[in-house]
Amino acid sequence: KTLVLGKEGESAELPCESSQKKITVFTWKFSDQRKILGQHGKGVLIRGGSPSQFDRFDSKKGAWEKGSFPLIINKLKMEDSQTYICELENRKEEVELWVFKVTANSDTHLLQGQSLTLTLESPPGSSPSVQCRSPRGKNIQGGKTLSVSQLELQDSGTWTCTVLQNQKKVEFKIDIVVLAFQKASSIVYKKEGEQVEFSFPLAFTVEKLTGSGELWWQAERASSSKSWITFDLKNKEVSVKRVTQDPKLQMGKKLPLHLTLPQALPQYAGSGNLTLALEAKTGKLHQEVNLVVMRATQLQKNLTCEVWGPTSPKLMLSLKLENKEAKVSKREKAVWVLNPEAGMWQCLLSDSGQVLLESNIKVLPTWSTPVQP
């Protein structure tokens, strides 16, 4: 008995070959002897029932001259899994068709961190093995249900599932979209008074995007977090619902989500968490954002540089006179110089690879007042 594997919704070709390699009479039947189609000597395809009943069944007329009389079944259904009989030249050829189906749990659009379940439906009596490969090359294998927990952004794309049965295989392609922000976390470094731009680009595109969001902020100086802004998203259009008076954030009306803080001030330095709840989805998308603020000041005979916000303990804060060696350099959040000499002083926040933030302050001779450029 020949075995043919098929995929639900697609087409299968069941073979039937003549030893003569020429056109001959043939008939395809179900195992209960009901006729499906055939050719009775006039080169005309005759169907065994009403057109509506047999419109999915066909043959390849062009192949008949070569002694090949395949049965083509279009728009395969799971119930097409059965034995088919080809009668020709006083012999019967049995062909077993097994139709498989691989589906993703409920939805192919899943939030980052959620689980993906891929389910194989197979005909009774079959014992297939299945292996699925993610777009980033991760292989999962198992029985009729395969699960991937904690979906990552890199899991977005085409998953390829290979079903193996009796050394024959059939391949399924399933497009999965992982709903997430492009970045899990970002840090913005600003001098006091500068405008701050926060951007929250999404890592996916969909036709219509509807939901609601909120930015909660934990300022370093505050004992508790507070909601800075809430907004709605309707078909990719952003509308602000509520915003605090201090700070008065502004929000862009289009995607990507974009927030502007008019001024970076020490009291705003800290960490925020933007959440986005999408319509018809359980769970929320999250992006962490951090703000580090630097202030350089001169009070009487003391030049001070301070930073506020979530900095790595490896960062170095330095005060130096332009084009000279650093006068003071510490892995702390504040440094100062007593009786600084006149000139342009630089406050630098650096790590092993770069200067992250720089603020200049002009120290005038002692009889003048300082100027901040």
Epitope: S185, V292, S312, P313, S318, S352, L356
Partner: antibody, heavy 122, light 107 residues
Framework: QVQLVESGGGVVQPGRSLRLSCAAS????????IHWFRQAPGKGLEWVAI????????FYADSVKGRFTISRDNSKNTVNLQMNSLRVEDTAIYYC???????????????WGNGTTVTVSS | AIQMTQSPSSLSASVGDRVTITCRAS??????LGWYQQKPGKAPMLLIY???NLQNGVPSRFSGSRSGTDFTLTISGLQPEDFAAYFC?????????FGQGTKLDVK
């Protein structure tokens, strides 16, 4: 391509000095911190020192502080490790590695040299 | 200095197995932890940085996670080339410190 090559290893008596070099190529050297790590025979890895991108800041493991000095020459794309008052326990393979620093948050050593062997023995 | 306690020190497994290695930090290091693989006679190779970020070119069977001060490296579906030594490294603060290492060999 991006690479680091160590040199200067050898056999030396306790109390003597040795100077290791790390030559970089294939990247903008002056934008990266460079570390020295070491691995004693059959043992785990140990961090030794780092020098920042501009040479202004240097940090050392307690076990080498006061004996080893790290320096760099950005015009020659090299980092040196001057090792004085060497001890038997300094015997190891010494690796230099490039540190990537992003946003003052993400740090990692993505490029390593193949190592140079230092043997301190009387 | 921050101490990193890595376990197990050695591990025997078979191709296809799922393997986990853990590192515990003696204090809060936020996400400042990387995982490195080392084969005999070779330099270490970066696998995961900042707790859970997969380095370019590293197979996706490697993943990292964190719970408080406990960090985990997971290899899902061991391949023959994965038998090696694995080290965690805290890069949160100086001095950087490594875990003692885990030697992964064939069962």
């Amino acid at each position: 391509q991006v690479q680091l090559v160590e040199s200067g290893g050898g056999v030396v008596q306790p109390g003597r000095s040795l100077r290791l070099s790390c030559a970089a190529s294939g990247f903008t050297f002056s934008s990266y911190g460079i570390h020295w790590f070491r691995q004693a025979p059959g043992k785990g890895l140990e961090w030794v020192a780092i020098i920042w991108f501009d040479g202004t800041n240097k940090f050392y493991a307690d076990s080498v502080k006061g004996r080893f000095t790290i320096s760099r020459d950005n015009s020659k794309n090299t980092v040196n490790l001057q090792m004085n008052s060497l001890r038997v326990e300094d015997t190891a393979i010494y690796y230099c590695a490039r540190e990537v620093a992003i946003q003052g948050y993400y740090y990692y050593m993505d490029v390593w040299g193949n190592g140079t062997t230092v043997t301190v023995s009387s | 200095a921050i101490q990193m306690t890595q376990s197990p020190s050695s591990l025997s497994a078979s191709v296809g197995d799922r393997v986990t290695i853990t590192c515990r930090a003696s204090q809060d290091i936020r996400n400042g932890l990387g995982w490195y693989q080392q084969k005999p006679g070779k330099a270490p190779m970066l696998l995961i940085y900042t707790t859970s970020n997969l380095q370019n070119g590293v197979p996706s069977r490697f993943s990292g996670s964190r719970s408080g001060t406990d960090f985990t490296l997971t290899i899902s579906g061991l391949q023959p080339e994965d038998f090696a030594a694995y080290f965690c490294l805290q890069d949160y603060n100086y001095p950087y410190t490594f875990g003692q290492g885990t030697k992964l060999d064939v069962k």
